[in-house]
């Protein structure tokens, strides 16, 4: 199925316009902003979601140290160019002809340049580290319960294959979720870790992208997990290219 037939809505993407104009009168949904048809049985790509968002009215130390090459999305929102499959185009430019190269999750990985800037390929983000700080609770969460519930969340809510959730680390109050997915590992039909991470990020912020859902209620043995801060680090298959000027 592509969308909920009874009332013609897209369960996995509320930022769509749906109508029964598909083959045989079937419900078909198109993303706001781009007008591209989306598959409502899976997650919509982050590129199309960002475009739609821009078109809408406005103990032993187990924690991971992000690599020196890890990227954080400091640039925030922009209106991206998406390819016909809904992926980010390697080169993004704004209305003032300032251009930059992005990775597969749409995060800038080079200095900004002009229209002469070349981005030869879309570099894949193969490792995502989601760093959360939860609100203080009566006691620490049980690590294995937390691990199981987060894996269940990514498997069932975001439809991400369990093999792509590499690890869940916990050192109260910090939780880290590691997602890993190489180009060679990602089969046709697999949810992209970048898309799963984006849906999770929006859920955690109380901005669920799912149709008709008020927000994420994540519980560990009945206790709500309340996230106070979220940081997401992106690691690309090829390290980013920034000038020394930016690093100092």
């Amino acid at each position: 199925h592509t969308a909920a037939q009874d009332n013609c809505t897209c369960p996995t993407n509320k930022m769509t316009v749906c109508s029964p104009d598909g083959p045989g009168g079937r419900c078909q949904c198109r993303a706001l902003g781009s007008g591209m048809a989306v598959d409502c049985s899976t997650l919509t790509s982050k590129c199309l979601l960002l475009k739609a968002r821009m078109s809408a009215p406005k103990n032993a130390r187990t924690l991971v140290r992000p690599s020196e090459h890890a990227l954080v999305d400091n640039d925030g929102l922009y209106d991206p160019d998406c390819d016909p499959e809904g992926r980010f185009k390697a080169r993004q430019c704004n209305q003032t002809s300032v251009c930059w190269c992005v990775n597969s999750v749409g995060v800038r990985r080079t200095d900004k340049g002009d229209l002469s800037l070349r981005c030869d390929e879309l570099v894949r983000t193969h490792h995502i580290l989601i760093d959360l700080r939860h609100r203080p609770t009566a006691g620490a969460f049980n690590h294995s319960d937390l691990d199981a519930e987060l894996r269940r969340l990514f498997r069932e809510r975001y439809r991400l294959h369990p093999k792509f959730v590499a690890a869940v680390h916990y050192e109260q109050p910090t939780i880290q979720i590691e997602l890993r997915q190489n180009t060679s590992q990602k089969a046709a039909g697999d949810v992209d870790i970048g898309d799963a991470a984006y849906y999770f990020e929006r859920d955690i912020k109380g901005e669920s992208l799912f149709q008709g859902r008020g927000g994420l209620d994540l519980r560990v043995r009945g206790e709500p997990l309340q996230v106070e801060r979220t940081l997401i680090y992106y690691l690309d298959e090829i390290p980013p290219k920034f000038s020394m000027k930016r690093l100092t």
């Epitope: 912020k205 109380g206 927000g215 209620d217 309340q226």
Partner: antibody, heavy 119, light 112 residues
């Protein structure tokens, strides 16, 4: 479609135990939690306990010593057992599904089992 | 344990009237991260199982008439029925899910 059907004895003798089964259809017990709620005649709703999708349980602290909730995922059944019943345990007993990560709201309820504690 | 207090316990109204009922919790039900409140409203008609009306304090469930509105945040919540219909006569319960679950004592809506 989502359904919860309850079965269990209507009459229980004082000091005996109560067992009610909630058989679900239209969803999996590995994806959704099931709660138990009761309502004495003419009174309000009281939450008893929950069996979470992952298999863990929580109970109303005032009744914890007398309650036990279990499940059989393969048979799509959740079981409530309550010991040492007294006359003030008389009432309607409901099972209800929570909405998983969309909130611990009880959007689907069983039809209720009327339990009378009497000699 | 979180206590939930509803008032009034009963309310006699005429059809077409606007009605408000209150629910107060003994501690805040607000998730500061998502800015959402762990509060629901249920309607129970005589001889029936309860029905979920409002989740997250203000999100109306599918199929619930828009005359029902939930509002409030933190510890103080309100259910408003803008123009009461005969079929709205029931008992209304609030429920917190911030720390497991607790129902309020209920507000009974009766015809004058």
């Amino acid at each position: 479609q989502v359904q919860l059907k309850q079965s269990g004895p209507g009459l229980v003798a004082p000091s005996q135990s109560l067992s009610i089964t909630c058989t679900v259809s239209g969803f999996s017990l590995t994806s959704y939690g099931v709660n138990w709620i009761r309502q004495p005649p003419g009174k309000g709703l009281e939450w008893l306990g929950v069996m979470w999708a992952g298999g863990s349980t929580n109970y109303n602290s005032a009744l914890m010593s007398r309650l036990s909730i279990s499940k059989d995922n393969s048979k799509s059944q959740v079981f409530l057992k309550m010991n040492s019943l007294q006359t003030d345990d008389t009432g309607m007993y409901y099972c209800a599904r929570d909405e998983n990560w969309d909130g611990a709201w009880f959007a689907y309820w069983g039809q209720g089992t009327l339990v009378t504690v009497s000699a | 344990d979180i206590q939930m207090t509803q008032s009034p316990s009963s309310l006699a109204v005429s059809a077409g009237e606007k009605v408000t009922m209150s629910c107060k919790s003994s501690q805040s039900l607000l998730n500061s991260g998502t800015r959402k409140n762990y509060l629901a409203w249920y309607q129970q008609k005589p001889g029936q199982s309860p029905k979920l009306l409002i989740s997250w304090a203000s999100s109306r469930e599918s199929g619930v008439p828009d005359r029902f509105t939930g509002s409030g945040s933190g510890t103080d919540f309100t259910l408003t029925i803008s123009s009461v219909q005969a079929e709205d006569l029931a008992v209304y319960y609030c429920k917190q899910s911030y720390n497991l679950f607790t129902f309020g004592g209920g507000t009974k809506l009766e015809l004058k």
